[in-house]
Amino acid sequence: LNTTILTPNGNEDTTADFFLTTMPTDSLSVSTLPLPEVQCFVFNVEYMNCTWNSSSEPQPTNLTLHYWYKNSDNDKVQKCSHYLFSEEITSGCQLQKKEIHLYQTFVVQLQDPREPRRQATQMLKLQNLVIPWAPENLTLHKLSESQLELNWNNRFLNHCLEHLVQYRTDWDHSWTEQSVDYRHKFSLPSVDGQKRYTFRVRSRFNPLCGSAQHWSEWSHPIHWGSNTSKENPFLFALEA
């Protein structure tokens, strides 16, 4: 984008690449120091945090955040009502569940109150920014002499989530990974009764209800089997 701006008095000036916010024709409309990027994450569709790097500003500034939903019944501009702070400077905004509309385009605007023409607007698809809580209540069932089934619960609509199971024995250097769809269960067909197994799971809001890239935190690990292998070097690291 190489933009030529015709200024009110007829001055022409060519600018470098930058994001132009809409300005009236009678106003200065020029490149300004970019505002920090806003990053939003919706936590389990219970609340949303939109944050920015306040330390990137040339001087400590309480930037303000406004938001609305594009082309919807919720298109009224809203002020942030719950700011997050870093060293007494605004660095984010928390929105509550009633203010979150996953399937409408979320528009977030950051503004410098000392110079309100210095503003940046971003459009976000919230369904791609959901991070579920970590899976809970991991349980293991022995289906047969050599087969284990891992089950877990999520505090969200199960059909909206995919999962990643990791497991390893006390002899393994690395985790073995297995993707699991919305069914939230995993079977390990061949278990060595002489080894101690550790399992953990994380979940993602993908692909049926959204296309989120961020995984939840890992669940608390759950263990199975012998823990009598004294000479094994990995055991204590696993339990840390």
Partner: antibody, heavy 118, light 112 residues
Framework: QVQLVQSGGGVVQPGRSLRLSCAAS????????MHWVRQAPGKGLEWVAV????????YYADSVKGRFTISRDNSKNTLYLQMNSLRAEDTAVYYC???????????WGQGTLVTVSS | EIVMTQSPLSLPVTPGEPASISCRSS???????????LDWYLQKPGQSPQLLMY???NRASGVPERFSGSGSGTDFTLKISRVEAEDVGVYYC?????????FGQGTKLEIK
């Protein structure tokens, strides 16, 4: 602390050139728009020119357009005003000033006198 | 081009008394974002100008509370609730809505 130290003023004949400098310290120079403002002897303030933080935009008062050029070197933390084809009416104290964008000039240089006289 | 007009041009004031300076613009300074782009500066004798108020009513850092600004559109006012001897100098309003940026002609405040 923020400082804007000006240099380059002096006496010059009509039609000649002069370059003013404004050395900045105590802040992130490359984050601020910079302006030149002048004040003729016994008169009020007149805005001359502005340059954006990255040098991509420049605006001028009609009275200096085509004769004066505002520029900056962010690696040297210095603002310049190249004044060509000087006229008697350009005689003034020239101030540099910083602004986060284009409003409110929160710090000013000490001023440097430019006298255009034959 | 926006023309800024101040009144009065000279303002003799007794210390402790209030003072008021008017500034008018030839066009509205109200931006579509709801803010008026008007600043006030004070130039004390022999000094560079200093910022007093920005966006009409925001006091710059270190400016005493006795200074206040008001107005919208084309009519603006700078008020000093109780003038002190250190307030002497020339007061300028300035519009930064559009280029060329422009100052008022200045109001000289002096102590009676």
């Amino acid at each position: 602390q923020v400082q804007l130290v000006q240099s380059g003023g002096g006496v010059v004949q009509p039609g000649r050139s002069l370059r003013l400098s404004c050395a900045a310290s105590g802040f992130t120079f490359s984050s601020y728009a910079m302006h030149w403002v002048r004040q003729a002897p016994g008169k009020g303030l007149e805005w001359v020119a502005v340059i954006s933080y990255d040098g991509s935009n420049k605006y001028y008062a009609d009275s200096v357009k085509g004769r004066f050029t505002i520029s900056r070197d962010n690696s040297k933390n210095t603002l310049y005003l190249q004044m060509n084809s000087l006229r008697a009416e350009d005689t003034a104290v020239y101030y540099c000033a910083r602004s986060l964008y284009y409003s409110h000039f929160d710090y000013w240089g000490q001023g440097t006198l430019v006298t255009v006289s034959s | 081009e926006i023309v800024m007009t101040q009144s009065p041009l000279s303002l003799p004031v007794t210390p402790g008394e209030p003072a008021s300076i008017s500034c008018r613009s030839s066009q509205s300074l109200l931006h579509s974002n709801g803010y008026n782009y008007l600043d006030w500066y004070l130039q004390k004798p022999g000094q560079s100008p200093q910022l007093l108020m920005y966006l009409v009513s925001n006091r710059a850092s270190g400016v005493p509370e006795r200074f206040s600004g008001s107005g919208s559109g084309t009519d603006f006012t700078l008020k000093i609730s109780r003038v002190e001897a250190e307030d002497v100098g020339v007061y300028y309003c300035m519009q930064t809505l559009q280029t060329p940026l422009s100052f008022g002609q200045g109001t000289k405040l002096e102590i009676k």
